[in-house]
């Protein structure tokens, strides 16, 4: 939560923003509220982004004023016009991209004064539900060494990967994780666990997106000996 106050000259007003994260390829909301004014025509909202020459968005005299808008935001922004009068200056952002991450400023002018507050906006893409594969995948017996691969796709930024057994005990040894960026800059994650089988065993992989606070889970259970394991584990 960031609360900003006004600039000298006029009275200052309180402007409040909340740091947030947006999903790539979806709508995002940059939150900003301010002390409301009784006349919509007296309210000016300007959104700016650090390192961007033009404005992100401007709303004044009750309507959008986009003559100064930077081209990277053209057709991608809107305020909630019916909520401006009650102090909502939040911005709707279309089709969030990696490049939208950064520091934004919500700058407000009303008849009561001026104020601004910064907002840190992060962007991310959720990781897909992991697919689990086993090698070898048949004639498994206790004491065999198997390789379990957990694969999750099209996330951003790089993931954190955790393995655990059926009792929730972390498995940290013999884990190799690789992350490769695709042509869009999104990451595909492959994590490999080498483990010696017990009589029965559940092995779980958790792929965490640190920005979106999103967890994707996959698990495989090996029961009964001897057994034949399907090439694609269902979970």
């Amino acid at each position: 939560l960031i609360i900003g106050f006004g600039i000298s000259g006029r009275h200052s007003i309180t402007v409040t923003t909340v740091a947030s994260a947006g999903n790539i390829g979806e709508d995002g909301i940059l939150s900003c509220t301010f002390e409301p004014d009784i006349k919509l025509s007296d309210i000016v909202i300007q959104w700016l982004k650090e390192g961007v020459l033009g404005l992100v968005h401007e709303f004044k005299e009750g309507k959008d004023e986009l003559s100064e808008q930077d081209e990277m935001f053209r057709g991608r922004t809107a305020v909630f016009a019916d909520q401006v009068i009650v102090g909502n200056a939040s911005l709707r952002l279309k089709n969030v991209q990696l490049t939208d991450a950064g520091t934004y400023k919500c700058y407000i002018i009303t008849s009561k004064g001026k104020g601004n507050a910064n907002l840190e906006y992060k962007t991310g893409a959720p990781y897909s539900k992991p697919s689990m594969t086993l090698e070898p995948n048949k004639d498994l017996r206790p004491g065999d060494t198997v390789t379990i691969t957990c694969s999750s796709y099209r996330g951003y930024p790089e993931a954190e990967v955790f393995w655990q057994d059926g009792q929730g005990v972390p498995l940290t040894g013999n884990v190799t994780t690789s992350q490769m960026a695709n042509e869009q800059g999104l990451f595909d994650v492959h994590s490999v666990l080498r483990v010696v089988l017990g009589a029965n065993g559940t092995y779980s992989c958790l792929v965490r997106n640190p920005v979106l606070q999103q967890d994707a889970h996959g698990s495989v259970t090996i029961t009964g000996q001897p057994m034949t394991f399907p090439p694609e584990a269902l979970w």
Partner: antibody
Framework: EVQLVQSGAEVKKPGASVKVSCKAS????????IGWVRQAPGQGLEWIGD????????NYNEKFKGRVTITRDTSTSTAYLELSSLRSEDTAVYYC??????????????WGQGTLVTVSS | DIQMTQSPSSLSASVGDRVTITCKAS??????VAWYQQKPGKAPKLLIY???TLQPGVPSRFSGSGSGRDYTLTISSLQPEDFATYYC?????????FGQGTKVEIK
């Protein structure tokens, strides 16, 4: 109620130009993008381009670039589509449509009735 | 430019049938896919936008889903008034693109 009323049918000769109008009412004209779409007889929908009346910004389908111009007159809340160097394959119904989402370019949620443009020698 | 490949181009179905139409984007991924219904001599009508949001006034038998490059329009129980042509629209990028259309005919 949002309404888009288009100009009447046109018959043009190959090589000529046509200008179709779309008069908007029931909302703030300068706050929403307006798009143009065409449909040749028995064919599918084809996006031509759009304009933000509040600033005159335009986007065009690469296929029509150089031949198409989208303009607006804010005093009459009217958008225009002009297509030049007409050929027989430009014979189609031309639709204007308002884009949802205000200054945000959304999907086309309200449509005009369509204008039939026939290109024939 | 992104192309939208729609399938099937036509289908025959009966009243009460469940109907599924798909659209595949040539590249990229975002949720900005809308679905339209068009009847002969009429302008298209918006049914669904942002992949799965139903336009007000549209019956709940229409639903949309999808992610990545693959998107689907489903009519859970086809009604007589649903026989029409359906189009998908990709509107996430600078340049918009329609699918080729799917004609739903009476079997």
């Amino acid at each position: 109620e949002v309404q888009l009323v288009q100009s009447g049918a046109e018959v043009k000769k190959p090589g000529a130009s046509v200008k179709v109008s779309c008069k908007a009412s029931g909302y703030t004209f300068t706050s929403y993008w307006i798009g143009w779409v065409r449909q040749a007889p028995g064919q599918g929908l084809e996006w031509i381009g759009d304009i933000y009346p509040g600033g005159g910004y335009t986007n065009y389908n690469e296929k029509f670039k150089g031949r198409v111009t989208i303009t607006r007159d804010t005093s009459t809340s009217t958008a225009y589509l002009e297509l030049s160097s007409l050929r027989s394959e430009d014979t189609a119904v031309y639709y204007c449509a308002r884009l949802d989402g205000s200054s945000y370019r959304g999907a086309m949620d309200s449509w005009g009735q369509g204008t039939l443009v026939t290109v024939s020698s | 430019d992104i192309q939208m490949t729609q399938s099937p181009s036509s289908l025959s179905a009966s009243v009460g049938d469940r109907v599924t139409i798909t659209c595949k984007a040539s590249q990229g991924f975002n949720k900005y896919v809308a679905w339209y219904q068009q009847k002969p001599g009429k302008a298209p009508k918006l049914l669904i936008y942002y992949t799965s949001t139903l336009q007000p006034g549209v019956p709940s038998r229409f639903s949309g889903s999808g992610s990545g490059r693959d998107y689907t329009l489903t009519i859970s129980s086809l009604q007589p008034e649903d026989f029409a042509t359906y189009y998908c629209l990709q509107y996430g990028n600078l340049l918009y693109a329609f699918g080729q259309g799917t004609k739903v005919e009476i079997k």
